[in-house]
């Protein structure tokens, strides 16, 4: 009695299971009752990723540099090509099909973690002793300046943007 | 002068072969990206693939994919394009273009785009029994 | 795939007057960088493309001021402010946010 269903990595065509094709490789004809499946190797710049009866390959993506992407992995005949953004830009998504350019921390806020090919740069207020100045994409919060350290007092106060003016302590008339 | 010059046309029967070459002068080949672009008699403008500078990634329109190759040796400062299984709707002028870019440095030129600013003169494939 | 319409598909034009083309494209060629990545290219009779005009509205090296690009997402036009006799021949745009790339049919100019 032909089969209903067929072992993994089969298929079952004409009432019986056939091999399907392994990674790398696409269908080129189906068994029979005397020939085994056969199977034909994906040609440079294709793949298939999964066991399959795909007549035709993928072709791996195009990392495209109009939209500020590169190759980080080229692809196989198993694998897709994997995509990056150039340096100062991050994927907008996790398929990496476009880039967007680092977000920069404005003044208050400091760079927690800078930015990736993959990750946007993530930024957090500056806290109390700490200030920022500049908008960046790169440079964490600083502390501010000890006066003390410099003999010397704090004239105006900090803030999470502006550090200490320090200034000279007043002598006391003899 | 920046100059592509292709070759490799002719007249070829259904099914058979044929390579082009588009031999590139005046600057430096292995820093641009190159596509090929075809023109049928009469007709518009249909582009046919892309490949990257090192050569490491390329793709291919729907309508060759499976029997057109785009390769290149930039040592040899060339581009080719290797047609098999060649169909009678493949006759066309083909056309080599270069991707014009902008040089890198400041945050936005990495991917600053300079439109396909410099095209060879064509090779005519003729695919006829 | 991104389709791309121009009109009109044929123009005749007065030496001294200004044209104007327009393509559409099916989806917007706005990408996140604020560039519009639409181009448009020339093929005089008998010779190869040339570009005129790249992401959107910037006019290539060499080509005369009376060419302009302009439009944004989906809408754009390229104009000619004063046609000249040398301007004839098929005016394409393509789109380059997208592989594959894909042009407009064509424009044919031709002096009236």
């Known amino acids: 009695e032909p089969p209903t269903a067929c072992r993994e990595k089969q298929y079952l065509i004409n009432s019986q299971c056939c091999s399907l094709c392994q990674p790398g490789q696409k269908l080129v004809s189906d068994c029979t009752e005397f020939t085994e499946t056969e199977c034909l190797p994906c040609s440079e710049s294709e793949f298939l990723d999964t066991w399959n009866r795909e007549t035709r390959c993928h072709q791996h993506k195009y990392c495209d540099p109009n939209l500020g992407l590169r190759v980080q992995q080229k692809g196989t005949s198993e694998t897709d090509t994997i995509c990056t953004c150039e340096e100062g830009l991050h994927c907008m998504s996790e398929s990496c099909e476009s880039c967007v350019p680092h977000r920069s921390c404005l003044p208050g806020f400091g760079v927690k973690q800078i930015a990736t090919g993959v990750s946007d740069t993530i930024c957090e207020p500056c806290p109390v002793g700490f200030f920022s100045n500049v908008s960046s994409a790169f440079e964490k919060c600083r502390p501010w300046t000890s006066c003390e350290t410099k003999d010397l007092v704090v004239q105006q106060a900090g803030t999470n943007k502006t550090d200490v003016v320090c200034g000279p302590q007043d002598r006391q008339r003899a | 002068q920046v100059q592509l010059v292709e070759s490799g046309g002719g007249v070829v029967q259904p099914g058979r072969s044929l390579r082009l070459s588009c031999a590139a002068s005046g600057f430096t080949f292995s820093s641009y990206g190159m596509h090929w672009v075809r023109q049928a008699p009469g007709k518009g403008l249909e582009w046919v693939a892309v490949i990257s500078n090192d050569g490491d990634n390329k793709y291919h329109a729907d309508s060759v994919w499976g029997r057109f190759t785009i390769s290149r040796d930039n040592s040899r400062s060339t581009l080719y394009l290797q047609m098999n299984s060649l169909r009678a709707e493949d006759t066309a002028v083909y056309y080599c273009?270069?991707?014009?870019?902008?040089?890198?440095?400041?945050?936005?030129?990495?991917?600053?785009?300079?439109?396909?600013?410099?095209w060879g003169q064509g090779t005519t494939v003729t695919v006829s029994s | 795939d991104i389709v791309m319409t121009q009109s009109p598909l044929s123009l005749p034009v007065t030496p001294g007057e200004p044209a104007s083309i327009s393509c559409r494209s099916s989806q917007s060629l706005l990408y996140s960088n604020g560039y519009n990545f639409l181009d448009w290219y020339l093929q005089k009779p008998g010779q190869s493309p040339q570009l005129l005009i790249y992401?959107?509205?910037n006019r290539a090296s060499g080509v005369p001021d009376r060419f302009s690009g302009s439009g944004s997402g989906t809408d754009f036009t390229l104009k000619i402010s004063r046609v000249e006799a040398e301007d004839v021949g098929v005016y394409y745009c393509?789109?380059?946010?997208?592989?594959?790339?894909?042009f407009g049919q064509g424009t044919k100019v031709e002096i009236k």
């Open positions: 393509m789109q380059a946010l997208q592989t594959p790339r894909t």
């Open positions: 992401l959107g509205s």
């Open positions: 273009a270069r991707r014009g870019m902008g040089s890198s440095g400041s945050r936005g030129d990495y991917y600053y785009y300079y439109g396909l600013d410099v």
